[in-house]
């Protein structure tokens, strides 16, 4: 689940929790003890920005080699640069690790644009600002790549946090998080708070500022406001969910809900944009255009090919609508909605011409592989990947960018019937036909 469109930071602006904390329902309490509360050592352990990905510091090998690793909930391989590359400041040197074990097997991962390939092995891995454990994990040592590493992104590898079903070369390669849970007492859940800056960051600002938090094994109350609402994980491959309704400024898009999930809907921290199936994208843009019709924007802007700029501090946020996605709830016929602001879907970018303007790229784009709820969505929310209970939780992030008039929201319950019908069933390919 790599960049381009797949694959900006809280830096002293806003971000204070809004409103009052609501009492939690007893139903929300975890089954395992110690899964909630404060995880001080893990708060603020991410850096980066939505356009280039968020990364966590990890160590591999003995003695430990420190690397920055992209956090990607849209893939399932732990893969690190293991050979010199013009965009890498450092890379994993297997020959220097006394605990490296070669699996004598290669792996090749092509993307729509670009690819990486490497050699499989295992080694000892830990997360300095994570749980105080060391695990033996599978590592793909990337020896060759094309359009994978990003110049200036400051990460040297990728941590695929999804399920074994989509691991390469096949589902027998245990993903990192599975190894972590099996080998330690870390509960089978993690949560992400990705913090967009609301303005573009240069290299030194990214390094100096916080990008968010990955809480491994728990939920930290300080990272969200209000209540957590959960949607079922439909199938354990990607983090697949079901969208049951879409509104632009409260106006229903009125599409058959199957269209919203054609051919799937996933939560993917390794994708920059909110990506929507072609029909849904066209309907959404039409509705957003109508809502912001006080001024015509060129087609190139809506296609992400042009930037829009305003004199610094004068961006007319109010002319852009809020976007609400209704997600299937945990209770029959119950849904909840997550609402993002233009501050999330207009992504700050540097002006090529002058620094006197605030410039943005439209960060909603078209997809041929279903809905992808990328950083644009995730930057509004604290997202709990509760693998133990096969569900994903959303709450308003304490660091989301907003203004004095509107805030991102997570609200419910709403009555929604026949939500199961919204899921699309991907036809199963007969594996044997692929062998010829």
């Amino acid at each position: 689940t790599q960049h381009g469109i797949r694959l900006p930071l809280r830096s002293g602006l806003g971000g204070a929790p809004l409103g009052l904390r609501l009492p939690r329902e007893t139903d929300e309490e975890p089954e395992e003890p110690g899964r909630r509360g404060s995880f001080v050592e893990m708060v603020d352990n991410l850096r980066g920005k939505s356009g280039q990905g968020y990364y966590v510091e990890m160590t591999v090998g003995s003695p430990p080699q420190t690397l920055n690793i992209l956090v990607d909930t849209g893939s399932s391989n732990f893969a690190v640069g293991a050979a010199p590359h013009p965009f890498l400041h450092r890379y994993y040197q297997r020959q220097l690790s006394s605990t490296y074990r070669d699996l004598r097997k290669g792996v090749y991962v092509p993307y729509t644009q670009g690819k990486w390939e490497g050699e499989l092995g295992t080694d000892l891995v830990s997360i300095p600002h994570g749980p105080n454990v060391t695990v033996r994990a599978n590592i793909a040592a990337i020896t060759e790549s094309d359009k994978f590493f990003i110049n200036g992104s400051n990460w040297e590898g990728i941590l695929g946090l999804a399920y074994a079903e989509i691991a390469r070369p096949d589902d027998s390669l245990e993903p990192f998080f599975d190894s972590l849970v099996k080998q330690t007492h870390v509960p089978n859940l993690f949560s992400l708070q990705l913090c967009g800056a609301g303005f573009p960051l240069n290299q030194s600002e990214v390094l100096a500022s916080v990008g968010g938090s990955m809480i491994i094994g728990g939920i930290d109350h300080s990272l969200y406001t209000g209540s957590l609402w959960y949607t079922p994980i439909r199938r354990e491959w990607y983090y697949e969910v079901i969208i049951v309704r879409v509104e632009i400024n409260g106006q229903d898009l009125k599409m058959d809900c199957k269209e919203y999930n054609y051919d799937k809907s996933i939560v993917d921290s390794g994708t920059t944009n909110l990506r929507l199936p072609k029909k849904v994208f066209e309907a959404a843009v039409k509705s957003i255009k109508a809502a912001s019709s006080t001024e015509k924007f060129p087609d190139g802007f809506w296609l992400g090919e042009q930037l829009v700029c305003w004199q610094a501090g004068t961006t007319p946020w109010n002319i852009f609508p809020v976007i609400s996605l209704y997600l299937m709830g945990e209770v029959t016929n119950q849904s909840f909605r997550i609402t993002i602001l233009p501050q999330q879907y207009l992504r700050p970018v540097e002006d090529v011409a002058t620094s006197q303007d605030d410039c943005y790229k439209f960060a909603i784009s078209q997809s041929s592989t279903g809905t992808v709820m990328g950083a644009v969505i995730m930057e509004g929310f604290y997202v709990v990947f509760d693998r133990a209970r096969k569900r994903i939780g959303f709450a308003v992030s304490a660091c989301h960018v907003h203004d004095e008039f509107r805030t991102a929201a997570v609200e419910g319950p709403f009555v929604t019937l026949d939500m199961e019908d919204c899921g699309y069933n991907i036809p199963q390919t007969d594996e044997s036909t692929l062998m010829t």
Epitope: T294, E295, F297, P298, G300, F301, E305, Q306, L307, V308, C309, W310, Q311, T314, P316, I319, D351, V352, A353, T354, D357, C359
Partner: nanobody
């Protein structure tokens, strides 16, 4: 929509010259600045030169005295005359335009596909 058409790139010996040009389609509110930036493999994007609608120009230090930007307002075209080229000028050169503000104060930035300039020693 703003369309940009670049031309003039190519290969040249160090010390040689090239002239890049970029033609932009008509735009209701006109263009308030046009210019060129470049990107060499593995390097950060660099703004080379800009020219505003009133004719004021700016250049990155490394090209001052060697490159000259000019424009033909009637044709919405911007040119970059590159003299005394050096191997370190090798890069893909992109034309960009920034429109003047519309009624909402919005300006739009567009960029071209880029034209390759290769300078060999």
């Amino acid at each position: 929509d703003v369309q940009l058409q670049e031309s003039g790139g190519g290969s040249v010996q160090a010390g040689g010259s090239l002239r890049l040009s970029c033609a932009a389609s008509e735009y209701t509110y006109g263009y308030c600045s046009m210019g060129w930036y470049r990107q060499a493999p593995g390097k950060e994007r660099e703004l080379v030169s800009t020219i505003t609608s009133d004719g004021s120009t700016s250049y990155v230090d490394s090209v001052k005295g060697r490159f000259t930007i000019s424009q033909d307002n009637a044709k919405n075209t911007v040119y970059l005359q590159m003299n005394s080229l050096k191997p370190e000028d090798t890069a893909k050169y992109y034309c960009y335009t920034k429109t003047c503000a519309n009624k909402l104060g919005a300006k739009f930035i567009s960029w071209g596909q880029g034209t390759q300039v290769t300078v060999s020693s």
